[in-house]
Interface confidence: low
């Protein structure tokens, strides 16, 4: 492992298409990829009138973006899919939404997702 | 009505530089992630580069990495993309092309391309 | 990355035939596939987004399904103006990558 990097090895797992898709609906999801590549955790959401659903959460390929991030925060102010990525085992488990430029609004999961 | 005007096209010889802008309207670009995808000639689509809404993620295909760098200029509506160190594979027509979200979603919205040959 | 493979590469048909074209990516990128027409010397369109969903302004006859690793693009009767070559791509992770294409052309 490199100093002071998390590394990845394991993240969690939800399809809210579970079904069409063939997956399980949650779970815990071991992360692969080239060696010479780093992995993440990542996770979308959406807020329908307050409430929390989530799209998916799983394992995410190596991107810079997501570089050295320990939690899982969306800045973007108001999308339609909150997207966020982070390093480190199950450091997708929770998430928030911390607009940039606006009062904090941070949504901490675990989160029942509502039945598919 | 969403527009995307791509401009900066032109014959370059190998190892120059270039910079192609789009200058968007019609939309709020300020919200919007903005993708660079090239076509050479006969050939089929490729992603080169995204931005995210404000710039502070950005991501390149493997092929242009280090060479180009994608920017925008939220106050000017414009994206931009500067291309270093040229080579003859580079030559395609450029598209720039919108997208919602940074991770998942499609490209709904297209320029009309501007052509870059390399070539000495 | 994540490899986009579309086939059939090109394929002849009449106006009012059902045309199926298929892409399959290397692993599963869930419903993270869009499709695109592209007619020459003009910008790619939109189609299909989200493995089923119809763009805006795209006509009922274009259907997309598929989730996990394969897809599907049909155009239930094709139309004079259908004639184009198509792409898939996921948006599943990036880099976006795309399918090869394949041409529709008049039998």
């Known amino acids: 492992a490199i100093l002071g990097r998390s590394e990845t090895q394991e993240c969690l797992f939800f399809n809210a298409n579970w079904e069409r898709d063939r997956t399980n609906q949650t779970g815990v999801e071991p992360c692969y990829g080239d060696k010479d590549k780093r992995r993440h955790c990542f996770a979308t959401w959406k807020n329908i009138s307050g409430s929390i659903e989530i799209v998916k959460q799983g394992c995410w390929l190596d991107d810079i973006n997501c570089y050295d991030r320990t939690d899982c925060i969306e800045k973007k102010d108001s999308p339609e899919v909150y997207f966020c990525c982070c390093e480190g085992n199950m450091c997708n488990e929770k998430f928030s939404y911390f607009p940039e430029m606006e009062v904090t609004q941070p949504t901490s999961n675990p989160v029942t997702p509502k039945p598919p | 009505e969403v527009q995307l005007l791509e401009s900066g096209g032109g014959l370059v010889q190998p190892g120059g530089s270039l910079r192609l802008s789009c200058a968007a309207s019609?939309?709020?670009?300020?919200?919007?992630?903005m993708n660079w995808v090239r076509q050479a000639p006969g050939k089929g689509l490729e992603w080169v580069a995204g931005?995210?809404?404000?710039?502070?993620?950005?991501s390149y295909a493997d092929s242009v990495k280090g060479r180009f760098t994608i920017s925008r200029d939220n106050s000017k509506n414009t994206l931009y993309l500067q291309m270093n160190s040229l080579r003859a594979e580079d030559t395609a027509v450029y598209y720039c092309?919108?997208?919602?979200?940074?991770?998942?979603?499609?490209?709904?919205?297209w320029g009309q391309g501007t052509l870059v040959t390399v070539s000495s | 990355d994540i490899q986009m493979t579309q086939s059939p590469s090109s394929l002849s048909a009449s106006v009012g035939d059902r045309v199926t074209i298929t892409c399959r990516a290397s692993?599963?990128?869930?419903?993270?596939v869009n499709w695109y027409q592209q007619k020459p010397g003009k910008a790619p369109k939109l189609v299909i987004y989200?493995?089923?969903s119809r763009a805006s302004g795209v006509p009922s006859r274009f259907s997309g399904s598929g989730s996990g690793t394969d897809f599907t693009l049909t155009i239930s009767s094709l139309q004079p103006e259908d004639f184009a070559t198509y792409y898939c791509?996921?948006?599943?992770?990036?880099?976006?990558?795309f399918g090869g294409g394949t041409k529709v052309e008049i039998k």
């Open positions: 019609g939309f709020t670009f300020s919200s919007y992630s």
């Open positions: 692993q599963s990128i869930l419903s993270f």
């Open positions: 092309a919108r997208s919602a979200n940074w991770h998942d979603t499609a490209l709904d919205y």
């Open positions: 791509q996921q948006s599943y992770n990036l880099p976006l990558t």
């Open positions: 989200a493995a089923t």
């Open positions: 931005i995210n809404y404000n710039g502070g993620y950005t």
